[in-house]
């Protein structure tokens, strides 16, 4: 699987999840988020050669087409597959508020 366990331990040029840390205050200007100060959002990147974690029959065909026609611009894209939520804490006045934000952390990627 093209997940963090594999991708973070290997120098993989093809489609894989890459580490990306986002600081809420410095990177996004969200000064009001109390905890966490930031988090690993991660992102997907890298080429999608034939049969690399193909998501659909279409991406398999597209990958094969791109392999047989290397000059063609059409090829599968490396995109998030599994995402996890992130829990944040902020204050409304002095009242703490905890929210779980869905699909915030990329855990694995696929070619689609």
């Amino acid at each position: 699987a093209l997940d963090t366990n594999y991708c973070f331990r290997n120098l993989e040029e093809n489609c894989c999840v890459r580490p990306l840390y986002i600081d809420f205050r410095q990177d996004l200007g969200w000064k009001w988020v109390h905890e966490p100060k930031g988090y690993y959002a991660n992102f997907c990147s890298g080429p999608c050669p034939y049969l690399r974690s193909a998501d659909t029959t279409h991406s398999t065909v597209l990958g094969l087409y791109n392999t047989l026609n290397p000059e063609a611009s059409a090829s599968p894209c490396c995109v998030p597959q599994d995402l996890e939520p992130l829990t944040i804490l902020y204050y409304v006045g002095r009242t703490p508020k905890v929210e779980q934000l869905s699909n915030m952390v990329v855990k694995s990627c696929k070619c689609s």
Epitope: G93, R94, K97
Partner: antibody, heavy 121, light 111 residues
Framework: EVQLVQSGAEVKKPGASVKVSCKTS????????MNWVRQAPGAGLDWMGQ????????NYNEMFEGRVTLTADTSTSTAYMELSSLRAGDIAVYYC??????????????WGQGTLVTVSS | DIVMTQTPPSLSVSPRETASISCRAS??????????MHWYLQKPGQSPQLLIY???NLESGVSDRFSGSGSGTDFTLRISRVEANDTGVYYC?????????FGQGTKLELK
Amino acid sequence: EVQLVQSGAEVKKPGASVKVSCKTSGYTFMKYWMNWVRQAPGAGLDWMGQIFPAWGSTNYNEMFEGRVTLTADTSTSTAYMELSSLRAGDIAVYYCARGYGNYALDAMDYWGQGTLVTVSS
Amino acid sequence: DIVMTQTPPSLSVSPRETASISCRASESVDSYGNSFMHWYLQKPGQSPQLLIYLASNLESGVSDRFSGSGSGTDFTLRISRVEANDTGVYYCQQNNEDPLTFGQGTKLELK
């Protein structure tokens, strides 16, 4: 230049709902909380609630008894305020106002021009 | 809810004089070393505009004739050398507690 442009005046019947829009420009919509404030004729300012457009988190003033719903469309940088079960006491000018940016509840540094909502049978 | 009481409800000031508006909160609006109190001016027929942020910080583009002071529950807005353009209703606002609340307003007019 930061701008908040609200939809036009509305006339509604008692018991109906109204939806006011606030189209923003000149800043990153998903970076700031958007507040809604109402002002009855000749009266002061009442904070209704707020929304964080990036993921739709909301905080409401309980005085509106769950009648207000705030939403945001990040594709058009537009915020919306819907008020249901309208009554005569809801006749007011409704403002959208951008939060200052340091806290969730905060001062408001840019305001829309206001939308007059009239309730009449 | 924190109740904000402004005094006086209205005042009439001669040009070039100094005007003072008080705002008293029903409980302290201080937290973490800040006073969560702000001041606005609503000119006739217009939307409110922010003047003072966090009790004493002048908002960008606002004349330095405006100044704010105070902490805890008692705050003051001062307008020096009052001009015709300063007429309108002044509001204080707190954001230390949910819900955010405003004072009832102070109407300033020129003599």
